[in-house]
Interface confidence: low
């Protein structure tokens, strides 16, 4: 390790004196940092001596000496104070800049230790500091203010008393910079435009930084335009906004434009597209078949999907019949934006009855005309079934009847014993019609078929079923013969045995 | 831009009280390191300076007027007030306010007048 | 207070000529000094603040210089617009004080 002499670590020197400040260490040795021009430096074999003829107070610091072969790397300092009774301080830096959170070191250097006792730190102008300004203070080094906010950054004098009276030191500007997170924020306004040509305009690029040091620029597909800037600060956070303003638009403003800005983060940047259109519009869609099928008693949501510019100016949900003529209620209709120009209309048809079903309509209107969008909305019923016996051209027939919606399928079954239901282990004989006669099917109505079984004999101790099915569920009916010895003949295509 | 304006009653008798607004755009007294100052200068005299008001409403009055000024400010409507009492025909004057502006917006406030207004003739007599 | 005395308090040059302007402090004012110009019927004019920084929009024929209590402005290559009055004003100390002005007269 390096030795300096005078051995120090302090020296005290009046203006103009020689200071000679020799380190000697085992091997070459060299003073740090910049020498000012008023000092000599010579070698002197395994030495090396500083020397000045005449000190002033601007030679007030800390000089340190190092070993560079030293692998420990070591290395000696003094401070030498050359105490000026007209400048008590030595200002090392006009400036100083710190991120946010760090501690800001001021270097005015006392010239006179004894001093130290008398110093204060102020704001220019003598302002007192800042509350909660939390500080500290160093002869060798200056004043620290500790963990430095951004409203710290400000002008600052160190004070000293001198026989009684405050002198100041030159002015040092504390710069506190915000740690920057990230690439500015970033707006453009609106996120979709549509215009008919000749209408006027406006998009709105705004990018706001915690730091004034950033850019911002709107471009329209590739070029970028030159637009006047405004700025502003407010919520602690700078703000630069960009206003596009075009007063008739034309095709050629159609496109797509971003809004970029950049800080030494990086880069951000969002895009809008401008449509331009020759006249007003309005498009009407559902995701949904226009053909619904519900089964009565369940719900259904119409959703219309709705693309319009001018805005809409009107609009309701109709019922068109066939049942009543009830309207649906405003309650259960619903409107839903999903941007500017695109909105989404419900109709919530909640325990569907037999009379709500039929025609369903949505009509908008807008500068462009009307729309409408219609759905048939069916409901779904599972099958009711009666069977009757009758006599047909002289003949025992059984009569089945069976209603509902989808068109129901009819089987006949021939069972061993009473029973109002046969089961599988009591199947006889089976007999699918597959055509069977269909009496009513009107829009929006049950299916009604009729089924036709031919008996000769139905006997005795036996059961026959007439069975209905659809997509939603299945009815049944069972006939007990009541008289014995009776046959059944069911039509040859008809039969087959489980 | 920024733009400044003083208005005053122009004529008033001694021991009266002066009442002078400075109107202002293209800043806000609510701007970190901002200020305005009043400064007078007497027919064929030099340049007095009054008052200072700084945006945290920190008020820096000249010593040998002090007891007669009061400097104030309204930041809603951009104005800057100064009232100085007991006239005397010695507070003839042509009446200026300036803004203290930032240098480097808002790490450092400004130490020096940037923007003045075009004065206003203030003069005291019986 | 401080006390600024500006020298010469009139001056006369000729277009294209150099001049210069002093200020000074009866006490240091550690560089905290502002030059302006006034013309007359009109508002006074910053040029230099903090002894030697232009202020912007100022032509780079203006400078400022000194340290302690002595201070100048120099106006390089006059032109006949610099016929103005000229005055310091230091702000190291409250209250704020003004050097007298110097008139500078165009031949």
């Known amino acids: 390790i390096p030795v300096i002499e005078p051995s120090g670590p302090e020296l005290v020197v009046k203006p103009g004196e020689t200071v000679t400040l020799r380190c000697v260490g085992n091997g070459s040795v060299e003073w740090d940092g910049p020498i000012s021009p008023h000092w000599t430096l010579y070698s002197d074999g395994p030495s090396s001596v500083l020397t000045t003829t005449n000190a002033t107070f601007q030679n007030t610091r800390t000089y340190r000496c190092t070993e560079p072969g030293d692998p420990l790397g070591g290395s000696a300092a003094i401070h030498l104070y050359v105490k000026d009774p007209a400048r008590p301080w030595n200002v090392l830096a006009k400036e100083v800049v710190v991120f946010e959170d760090q501690d800001a070191l001021l270097p005015c250097l006392l010239t006179d230790p004894v001093l130290e006792a008398g110093v204060s730190l102020v704001r220019l102008r003598g302002r007192p500091l800042m509350r909660h300004t939390n500080y500290s203070f160093s002869p060798w080094h200056g004043f620290t203010i500790h963990r430095a906010k951004f409203i710290q950054g400000q002008d600052y004098q160190c004070s000293a008393l001198m026989g009684g009276r405050k002198v100041m030191s030159i002015s040092i500007r504390l710069k506190v910079q915000k740690v920057i997170p990230g690439p500015p924020a970033l707006t453009l306004v609106p996120a979709e435009l549509v215009r008919i040509r000749g209408e006027a305009a406006q998009i709105v690029c705004s990018a706001s930084n915690i730091d004034v040091d950033f850019d911002v620029f709107l471009q329209h597909n590739t070029t970028k335009l030159a637009i006047p800037q405004r700025s502003d600060f407010h919520d602690n956070r700078y703000q630069k906004v960009l206003t596009l303003s075009l007063g008739q638009v034309d095709f050629q403003h159609a496109g797509n434009y971003s809004c970029v800005a950049s800080n030494v983060q990086g880069k951000h940047s969002t895009s809008m597209f401008f449509r331009v259109v020759e006249s007003a519009y309005l498009d009407l869609s559902s995701e949904q078949n226009l053909i619904q099928e519900v089964t009565v008693g369940e719900g259904l949501n119409l959703k219309v999907m709705v693309e319009a510019y001018p805005g809409l100016q009107g609009f309701n949900w109709t019922y068109l019949g066939p049942f009543s003529d009830h309207q649906p209620e405003p309650k259960l209709a619903n409107a839903t934006t999903k941007d500017t120009y695109r909105h989404t209309f419900t109709l919530s048809l909640p325990r569907l009855k037999p009379s709500e079903a039929g025609c369903y309509s949505f009509l908008a209107r807008n500068p462009g005309g009307w729309r409408a969008l219609t759905f048939e909305l069916t409901l779904r019923y599972p099958p009711e079934v009666s069977v009757i016996w009758t006599s047909i051209n002289g003949s025992g027939t059984l009569l089945c009847a069976a209603s509902g919606y989808p068109q129901p399928n009819v089987t006949w079954l021939q069972c061993a014993g009473h029973t109002d239901r046969c089961d599988e282990a009591q199947v006889l004989q089976v007999w699918v019609d597959p055509h069977p006669e269909v009496l009513s099917q009107e829009p929006f109505q049950k299916v009604t078929v009729q089924s036709l079984l031919t008996a000769e004999t139905l006997e005795h101790n036996q059961t026959y079923e007439c069975r209905a099915h659809n997509s939603v569920g299945s009815g049944s009916w069972a006939f007990i013969p009541i008289s014995a010895g009776a046959r059944t003949h069911p039509p040859d295509e008809f039969l087959f045995t489980p | 831009q920024v733009t400044l304006k003083e208005s005053g009653p122009g004529i008033l008798q001694p021991s009266q009280t002066l009442s002078l607004t400075c109107t202002f755009s293209g800043f806000s007294l609510t701007t970190y390191g901002m200020g305005v100052g009043w400064i007078r200068q007497p027919s064929g005299k030099g340049l007095e300076w009054l008052a200072n008001?700084?945006?945290?409403?920190?008020?820096y009055y000249n010593p040998s007027l002090k007891n007669r000024l009061t400097i104030s400010k309204d930041t809603s409507n951009n104005q800057a007030f100064l009232k100085l009492t007991n006239v005397h025909t010695s507070d003839s004057a042509t009446y200026y306010c300036a803004r203290i502006g930032p240098i480097k917006y808002p790490t450092a406030p400004y130490r020096y007048f940037d923007f003045w207004g075009p004065g206003t003739m203030v003069t005291v007599s019986s | 207070d401080i006390q600024m005395t500006q020298s010469p308090a009139s001056l006369s040059a000729s277009l294209g000529e150099t001049v210069s302007i002093e200020c000074l402090a009866s006490e240091d004012i550690y560089d905290n000094l502002a030059w302006y110009q006034k013309k007359p019927g009109k508002s006074p004019h910053l040029l230099i603040y903090?002894?030697?920084s232009l202020q912007d929009g100022v032509p780079s024929r203006f400078s400022g210089s000194g340290s302690g209590t002595q201070y100048s402005l120099k106006i390089n290559s006059l032109e006949s617009e610099d016929a103005a009055t000229y005055f310091c004003l230091q702000d190291s100390e409250y209250p704020w004080t003004f050097g007298g002005g110097t008139k500078l007269e165009l031949k």
């Open positions: 008001i700084w945006w945290d409403d920190d008020k």
């Open positions: 903090y002894a030697s």
